[in-house]
C-alpha cells in the first residue's frame, strides 16, 4: 500500500520521489498526477518535467524544490487545503516498454490542531526517535528537541505494531505535527 503523509491545512506538503539518473545528468521525464498511478502516463497531471526542466504545472502551488538535476523530483504542494487530500502518483518515465517507475503516495490533509502540544510528548518523541525528526522539507535535520511541533516530519518504521502507529498518529494529529509512516 502507498506511504502516507500528513500535512495541516495552510502548511506545505512534501511528497518524496527520486531516482538516480544514469549516467549522472541524463534526466528522464517525470509526471506527478492526482490519483493512483494508472497503466499509462499520469492521470490528472499536476506537474510534468521533460529532460531539462518543469514544462507543465497546473497550479503555482506545485513545485519541485529539490535538486531536480540529481533526480530529486519530490513534490511540494504549497498552502494545502482539505481538497488536496488523496493519492498522488509520481511516475518516472524511463524509456522503453513498461519501464516506468511508479510510486503512489497518499496525502492526508488535516485541520490545524487547536491544542498546544504537551512538553512531555515532545520530549518523549525526541528521545524515542532521535534521528527521525526533520524540520526542513528535504530530509532529516540534526537531532534536536524542538520547541514546538507544527512543521516536524516524523518517520515511523514499519516494525512498530499497528496499534502503536495508530496511537502515535493520533497524538501527532492532536499536536499539529506532520507525520510520515513508512
Amino acid at each position: 500500500s502507498e506511504v502516507e503523509y500528513i500535512a495541516e491545512v495552510g502548511q506545505n506538503a512534501y511528497l518524496p520521489c527520486s531516482y538516480t539518473p544514469a549516467p549522472p545528468g541524463n534526466l528522464v521525464p517525470v509526471c506527478w498526477g492526482k490519483g493512483a498511478c494508472p497503466v499509462f502516463d499520469c492521470s490528472n497531471v499536476v506537474l510534468r518535467t521533460d529532460n531539462r526542466d518543469v514544462n507543465d504545472r497546473t497550479s503555482g502551488r506545485y513545485w519541485l524544490k529539490g535538486d531536480f538535476h540529481k533526480g530529486d523530483v519530490s513534490l511540494t504542494i504549497e498552502n494545502v487545503t482539505l481538497a488536496d487530500s488523496g493519492v498522488y502518483c509520481c511516475r518516472i518515465q524511463i524509456p522503453g516498454i513498461m519501464n516506468d517507475e511508479k510510486h503512489n503516495v497518499k496525502l492526508v490533509v488535516i485541520k490545524p490542531a487547536k491544542v498546544t502540544p504537551a512538553p512531555t510528548l515532545q520530549r518523549d518523541l525526541t528521545s524515542a526517535f532521535p534521528r527521525m525528526l526533520t524540520t526542513g522539507e528535504h530530509g532529516p535535520a540534526e537531532t534536536q528537541t524542538p520547541g514546538s511541533l507544527p512543521d516536524v516530519n516524523l518517520t515511523v518504521s514499519n516494525f512498530f505494531c499497528e496499534l502503536q502507529i495508530f496511537t502515535l498518529t493520533n497524538e501527532l494529529r492532536d499536536s499539529g505535527a506532520t507525520i510520515r509512516t513508512a
Epitope: G35, A36, P38, V39, F40, D41, S43, V87, G96, N104
Partner: antibody
Framework: EVQLVESGGDLVQPGGSLRLSCAAS????????MTWVRQAPGRGLEWVAN????????YYVDSVKGRFTLSRDDAKNSLYLQMNSLRAEDTAVYYC?????????WGQGTLVTVSS | ETVMTQSPATLSVSPGERATLSCRAN??????LAWYQQKPGQAPRLLIY???TRATGFPARFSGSGSGTEFTLTISSLQSEDFAVYYC?????????FGGGTKVEIK
C-alpha cells in the same frame, strides 16, 4: 469540435492484411495518446493498442502482439493500425479513441470481417 | 489480467426509477475506473472517469462511486435517453480491461 473518423475496414480472408486509418480533427493531435479499441459483433469492448504522443512507445494486447502495428503521422493528424495474419477472432468493429487510460472521444468505428 | 465483472447483465427499470449498476474487479484498481455508455449502433461515450468524475455532457443524475475493487454507477431517475449498455473499464493494471456490460432496458 473533436472528430475521429475511421476507415479501411473490409472483408478479408484469414491470414490476410488490412490497414485501418483514423483521421483526427478539432484538437491538437500531437499532444494526445491515441488508442484502438475493438468490439466483436454482439460482444463487449476490448482494448487493442495505444501509442504515446511522440510515437516513442506503443503497447499491444497480447492477442495481437507481433501481428498488428500501430503508427501515427502527426503532420497528417492520422493514426494507423496495420493488421497482418488476421484471424476469425479479429472480426470486430474497430474504434479509434483519444486518450491513454480512459477515452474521452471515440470515432464511429470501422468493421473488419475475417472470413473465408 | 484484471477481470472486471458487471452485474446484473440486464437491468429492467421503469422511467423515473433509480438504477444501480455494479462493477467488481478481482484485484485493487484504486479509483482508476471509467464508465461508458453505449447505445445501439453508436460508439461508446465516456460517462465517468476516476471512479466518480462525471464527463462533459452528462447530467448530474449520473454518479459513480467506489474504490479498490467495488464500484457503482447510479442513475438517480432514469430518462428515456438513458436506456443503453454501460461498461466499466479499469486502467490501473496491465492490460486495460472492460467489464462485460450491463444493459439497462425499459421495464
Amino acid at each position: 469540435e473533436v472528430q475521429l473518423v475511421e476507415s479501411g475496414g473490409d472483408l478479408v480472408q484469414p491470414g490476410g492484411s488490412l490497414r485501418l486509418s483514423c483521421a483526427a480533427s478539432g484538437f491538437t493531435f500531437s499532444t494526445y495518446w491515441m488508442t484502438w479499441v475493438r468490439q466483436a459483433p454482439g460482444r463487449g469492448l476490448e482494448w487493442v493498442a495505444n501509442i504515446k504522443q511522440d510515437g516513442s512507445a506503443k503497447y499491444y494486447v497480447d492477442s495481437v502482439k507481433g501481428r498488428f502495428t500501430l503508427s501515427r503521422d502527426d503532420a497528417k493528424n492520422s493514426l494507423y493500425l496495420q493488421m497482418n495474419s488476421l484471424r476469425a477472432e479479429d472480426t470486430a468493429v474497430y474504434y479509434c479513441a483519444r486518450g491513454s487510460n480512459w477515452f474521452d472521444y471515440w470515432g464511429q468505428g470501422t468493421l473488419v470481417t475475417v472470413s473465408s | 489480467e484484471t477481470v472486471m465483472t458487471q452485474s446484473p447483465a440486464t437491468l429492467s427499470v421503469s422511467p423515473g426509477e433509480r438504477a444501480t449498476l455494479s462493477c467488481r474487479a478481482n484485484q485493487n484498481v484504486y479509483s482508476n475506473l471509467a464508465w461508458y455508455q453505449q447505445k445501439p449502433g453508436q460508439a461508446p461515450r465516456l460517462l465517468i472517469y476516476d471512479a466518480s468524475t462525471r464527463a462533459t455532457g452528462f447530467p448530474a443524475r449520473f454518479s459513480g462511486s467506489g474504490s479498490g475493487t467495488e464500484f457503482t454507477l447510479t442513475i438517480s431517475s432514469l430518462q428515456s435517453e438513458d436506456f443503453a449498455v454501460y461498461y466499466c473499464q479499469q486502467y490501473n493494471n496491465w492490460p486495460l480491461t472492460f467489464g462485460g456490460g450491463t444493459k439497462v432496458e425499459i421495464k
